[in-house]
Interface confidence: low
């Protein structure tokens, strides 16, 4: 195995289904962090610049994307559920942030060697005004 | 946890930026229901997890399936789990 083989995650937020909103009056956003190796990441949700914990559920551990492969890359998913009215308020801003700590031997994810920087990767969505 | 009023549903979600991944959300199902892993290596399914909306005193089970396959559909995403046929909500071609 190449010890320098470290892959950061790709992060994407998926917007709630209008079907869910009309059926339940709730809205679930899904965050996917995919394609990372090794398997240690930390995922958090931020609403209007503040980290939130209520309404959040994250996989307890990452999933191997190719279980048969010894050095498979990993994925992690998380859900954030809010009320339909909260989602439909266009002023509300939702962000999924994934911190990835596996650093290759030449520190390629660190911009400034003097500071304890971790790589932060995020994806975001804005609330949608009613159609 | 005890889910008071299970209302199992599968919804298709749309990415906020253009990507090839399709995501299906299976939610609001009873705690006795198990979610099976996919036999298709290109389809990824998470274990069920519990979400607690504390401000609304509401808990729900959920699992997510996703794939980059062009023919991936939510109706078949959880085909290895026992899900009632009326669980699937079609996704409109375009909202708004």
């Amino acid at each position: 195995e190449d010890l320098k083989k470290v892959f950061p995650p790709k992060v994407a937020v998926f917007e709630p289904s209008e079907a869910e909103i009309s059926h339940t009056q709730k809205a679930t956003l899904v965050c996917l962090a995919t394609g990372f190796y090794p398997d240690h990441v930390e995922l958090s949700w931020w609403v209007n610049g503040k980290e939130v914990h209520s309404g959040v559920s994250t996989d307890p551990q990452p999933l191997k994307e190719q279980p048969a492969l010894e050095d498979s890359r990993y994925s992690l998913s998380s859900r954030l559920r809010v009320s339909a009215t909260f989602w439909h308020n266009p002023r509300n801003h939702f962000r999924c942030q994934v911190q990835f700590y596996g650093l290759s031997e030449d520190d390629e994810w660190t911009e400034d060697r003097d500071k304890p920087i971790t790589q932060k990767i995020s994806a975001e969505a804005w609330g949608r005004a009613d159609c | 946890p005890y889910i008071q009023n299970p209302d199992p549903a599968v919804y298709q979600l749309r990415g906020s930026k253009s990507n090839d991944t399709s995501v299906c959300l299976f939610t609001d199902f009873d705690s006795v229901m198990n979610v099976s892993q996919s036999k298709d290596s290109d389809v990824h399914i998470t274990d069920k997890t519990v979400l607690d909306m504390r401000s609304m005193d509401f808990k729900s089970n959920g699992a997510v399936a996703w794939s980059n396959k062009s023919d991936f559909a939510c109706t078949s995403a959880f085909k290895d789990s026992v899900i009632p046929a009326d669980t699937f909500f079609p996704s409109p071609e375009s909202s708004c």
Epitope: P38, H40, P60, Q61, P62, Q99, Y101, G102, K115, T118 | -
Partner: nanobody, 117 residues
Framework: EVQLVESGGGVVQPGGSLRLSCVAS????????YGWYRQAPGKEREKVAH???????DYADSAKGRFTISRDESKNTVYLQMNSLRPEDTALYYC???????????WGQGTLVTVSS
């Protein structure tokens, strides 16, 4: 800064067993990944086994079925139980830890395992 100290190496006959230990000190709560690696004379360093904070384990093909990685959080120690040792397992065995803070990646000094009759 995290420090890793390996122990448990030695000389063993083919078919024998050894248990390597890696004790982590300082900032251990910031570690979320451990690995055992080895380097045989004249060869590149290679992965033997990994264990993550969720106790997910991963083994090199050569270690599967013979070696077991485990950790004791209360002792800040990671173990590598090696059974059915072969001459080709002779190498310097290193412990590795990945941390959440700079400088992220830590290695021990290594412990020598020699399998010989």
């Amino acid at each position: 800064e995290v420090q890793l100290v390996e122990s448990g190496g030695g000389v063993v006959q083919p078919g024998g067993s050894l248990r390597l230990s890696c004790v982590a000190s300082y900032d251990v709560h910031k570690i979320n990944f451990y690995g055992w690696y080895r380097q045989a004379p004249g060869k590149e360093r290679e992965k033997v086994a990994h264990i993550s904070i969720g106790d997910q384990t991963d083994y090199a093909d050569s270690a599967k079925g013979r070696f077991t990685i485990s950790r004791d959080e209360s002792k800040n120690t990671v173990y590598l139980q090696m059974n059915s040792l072969r001459p080709e397992d002779t190498a310097l065995y290193y412990c590795r830890a990945l941390s959440k803070i700079w400088p992220y990646d830590y290695w021990g000094q290594g412990t020598l395992v020699t399998v010989s009759s």
